[in-house]
């Protein structure tokens, strides 16, 4: 058993049929010594008496809010949550496996630049009685500070018969050095509580590996005289790290016909302009990637040829 926060405790249980469970000793936080009784949740049924109460925790029916009283007055509370371990593996019932980039990916994180700011998100099909708490650091043995905000519901989607809820959190490394080579990874830890079930999820990464620039901005077409060619121009996204001479991007320019089956023409360039042939009813799209490190491409920025 360990303390998650004040008056909230997590009991770790091996989960199998007829498991013995865990003996837990609850102590009433009071200078009183006599006349103390204990109840569970909203029930007025007395479990027992004494300043300490020993309970055998085996299942979710044994978890909940234990309260000690004296003469009708509440003295203190202890909320017990359960963390299940089945066949040596901690349960992952609360969050959905996103399966990207690999199986057992519950947390996904992205950064728009090298400032030390990043966003993580996760999915669940649970809509109520759900709380999340996020902590982060750089390194784990001698951790350096990363400050995370509160996790918020950022999207709701219908997937077949189920509703899926996306939660996200923004974090900022306290003393980030954008130009420095990373030697220690960022660690992100999410505590998830659904009713009386506790689970924790972790992710470890270097900022350089989760970089995904915003799409190029101000995408414009300039027709070239007496030609089907156009000059496409764009700018670095506002969110990208500066100076651009050091934090450089490379770009992919794509000409795509109306039909998905039509052949795509692609040009790769380090410049912020390119000359392409603009076919009727086609569109031109541009995306960006870090020039010196192959992390994710941005989403496409697009304009129609016409």
């Amino acid at each position: 058993i360990w303390e998650l926060k004040k008056d909230v405790y997590v009991v770790e249980l091996d989960w199998y049929p007829d498991a013995p469970g865990e003996m837990v000793v609850l102590t009433c936080d009071t200078p009183e010594e006599d006349g103390i009784t204990w109840t569970l949740d909203q029930s007025s049924e007395v479990l027992g008496s004494g300043k300490t109460l020993t309970i055998q925790v085996k299942e979710f029916g044994d978890a909940g809010q234990y309260t000690c009283h004296k003469g009708g007055e509440v003295l203190s509370h202890s909320l017990l949550l359960l963390h299940k371990k089945e066949d040596g593996i901690w349960s992952t019932d609360i969050l959905k496996d996103q399966k990207e980039p690999k199986n057992k990916t519950f947390l996904r994180c992205e950064a728009k630049n090298y400032s030390g700011r990043f966003t993580c998100w996760w999915l669940t099909t649970i809509s109520t009685d759900l709380t999340f708490s996020v902590k982060s650091s750089r390194g784990s043995s001698d951790p350096q500070g990363v400050t995370c905000g509160a996790a918020t519901l950022s999207a709701e989607r219908v997937r077949g018969d189920n509703k899926e809820y996306e939660y996200s959190v923004e974090c900022q490394e306290d003393s980030a050095c954008p130009a420095a080579e990373e030697s220690l990874p960022i660690e992100v830890m999410v505590d998830a509580v659904h009713k009386l079930k506790y689970e924790n999820y972790t992710s470890s990464f270097f900022i350089r590996d989760i970089i995904k620039p915003d799409p190029p901005k101000n995408l414009q077409l300039k027709p070239l005289k007496n030609s089907r060619q156009v000059e496409v121009s764009w700018e670095y996204p506002d969110t990208w790290s500066t100076p651009h001479s050091y934090f450089s991007l490379t770009f992919c320019v794509q000409v795509q016909g109306k039909s998905k089956r039509e052949k795509k023409d692609r040009v790769f360039t380090d410049k912020t302009s390119a000359t392409v042939i603009c076919r009727k009813n086609a569109s031109i799209s541009v995306r960006a990637q870090d020039r010196y490190y192959s992390s994710s491409w941005s989403e496409w920025a697009s304009v129609p040829c016409s």
């Epitope: 479990l47 008496s49 309970i55 029916g61």
Partner: nanobody, 115 residues
């Protein structure tokens, strides 16, 4: 009429074990949290252990310290108390009760721990 009949008490040496039983009748046993309470010679009634209606939250007094195990069999309307590592100070009349104060209880079974 509510009836609670305890059995299984006796004389045992320190460190020994006993299993107490309590046969319940006259009420819907499976709907009630059940309790064991005890009264040592010349002392007041003392709560020992309790167990929820569906077997959840077995709870124990501090002095039990993992030595006693409470259980129930709702099909047989029977409550049990497995007692091990018995000490001289566990000597008492043990009652099965339907409330933690022992208002509704049986006649008791005597447990004597002595060398």
């Amino acid at each position: 009429e509510v009836q609670l009949v305890e059995s299984g008490g006796g004389l045992v040496q320190p460190g020994g074990s006993l299993r107490l039983s309590c046969a319940a009748s006259g009420f819907n046993f499976s709907n009630y949290r059940m309790y064991w309470v005890r009264q040592a010679p010349g002392k007041g009634l003392e709560w020992v252990s309790s167990i929820g209606a569906i077997g959840n939250v077995p709870a124990y007094a501090d002095f039990v310290k993992g030595r006693f195990t409470i259980s129930r069999d709702n099909a047989k309307n029977t409550l049990y108390l497995e007692m091990s590592s018995l000490k001289v100070e566990d000597t008492a009349l043990y009652y099965c009760a339907r409330d933690y104060q022992g208002v509704v209880r049986g006649k008791g079974t005597l447990v004597t721990v002595s060398s």
